[in-house]
């Protein structure tokens, strides 16, 4: 039985040209995490694998940095970065846990971080 839960940064907003940290946390399970994927809609952004470390998709290499922890930092944000982001935890023996974050990139300078997490 899958007992784990994922807490995410939820719905967040950021300014165009700025950066944002996407974070997910898996808790309430003793299952072993073997890999964490970060995806934007159907595009793979990055992978953190237990044996291979981080892999950043070539098309995002200039704008994506791994961390902190298993999170992902998006830099030089554009309005086109607005949308859904998913963290996918691959675990054994539970299987897959998925968390969802919605990011809105704003043109104005009044963007506020509407999240439960404090974004440094």
């Amino acid at each position: 039985m899958m007992t784990g839960t994922i807490e995410t940064t939820g719905n967040i907003s950021a300014e165009k040209g700025g950066s944002i940290i996407l974070q997910c946390h898996l808790s309430s399970t003793t299952a072993q995490v073997t890999q964490v994927n970060w995806e934007q809609q159907d595009q793979l952004l990055a992978i953190c694998n237990a044996d291979l470390g981080w892999h950043i998709s070539p098309s995002f290499k200039d704008r994506v940095a791994p961390g902190p922890g298993l999170g992902l930092t998006l830099q030089s944000l554009t309005v086109n970065d607005t949308g859904e982001y998913f963290c996918i935890y691959h675990t054994y023996p539970d299987g897959t846990y998925t968390g969802r974050i919605f990011l809105e990139v704003l043109e104005s300078s009044v963007a506020e971080h509407g999240a439960r997490f404090q974004i440094p």
Partner: antibody, heavy 117, light 107 residues
């Protein structure tokens, strides 16, 4: 197997600079963060900063920003930490440690830095 | 910066006892908390990652629990090799920080 090799010790004069090295082997060097940690006289551990060799991205604790510069040489799979304007307060053991999916999973043996005239 | 407070500073126990070490975070760090053991003149060794994830090669008598601000490292039936320093560390945000440590000594 994963190994992080550090020189055992360095002796430098006050006011001078030093470059500590950490040579990695046994894994894909550009796929993991490398961190540096300071420990004085067997006391607590202090996080100094980190570097991601795949992109040269760095982060520093504010306390060490004016003291430390982290660099990387991917051709030799080596991370360097440059410490400037050394004082006795910089005398400590400095560890490099790799961060993987399971946090700081491998550590170097540490370099004992002694600042003395 | 995130502050990690470990307690007690020193714990005197007998081999065979079971102990719980505490690490408190301020503010909330979800589950981004890791535990390390360090023996004299050795490098730290990872025991538990992300609050409760077991690490290959670490004896099963070590376990971790907690989330948010309160975390516990439990050691069942202490062996003589378990005595030393224990540190917690957070990776929720940069700068990463460590707790001040708990010294586990033989009574």
């Amino acid at each position: 197997q994963v190994q992080l090799q550090q020189p055992g010790s360095e002796l430098v004069r006050p006011g001078a600079s030093v470059k500590l090295s950490c040579k990695a082997s046994g894994y894909t060097f550009t796929s993991y963060w490398m961190h540096w940690v300071k420990q004085r006289h067997g006391q607590g551990l202090e996080w100094i900063g980190n570097i991601f060799p795949g992109s040269d991205t760095t982060n520093y604790d504010e306390k060490f920003k004016s003291k430390v510069t982290l660099t990387v040489d991917t051709s030799s799979s080596t991370v360097y930490m440059h410490l400037s304007s050394l004082t006795s307060e910089d005398s400590a053991v400095y560890y490099c440690t790799r961060e993987g999916l399971y946090a700081f999973d491998y550590w170097g043996q540490g370099t004992t830095l002694t600042v003395s005239s | 910066d995130i502050v990690l407070t470990q307690s007690p500073a020193t714990l005197s126990v007998t081999p065979g006892d079971s102990v719980s070490l505490s690490c408190r975070a301020s503010p909330n760090i979800r589950n981004s908390l890791h535990w390390f053991q360090q023996k004299s003149h050795e490098s730290p060794r990872l025991l538990i990652s992300y609050a409760s994830q077991s690490i290959s090669g670490i004896p099963s008598r070590f376990s971790g629990s907690g989330s948010g601000t309160d975390f516990t490292l439990s050691i069942n039936s202490l062996e003589t090799e378990d005595f030393g320093m224990y540190f917690c560390q957070q990776s929720n945000s940069w700068p990463y920080t460590f707790g001040g440590g708990t010294k586990l000594e033989i009574k």
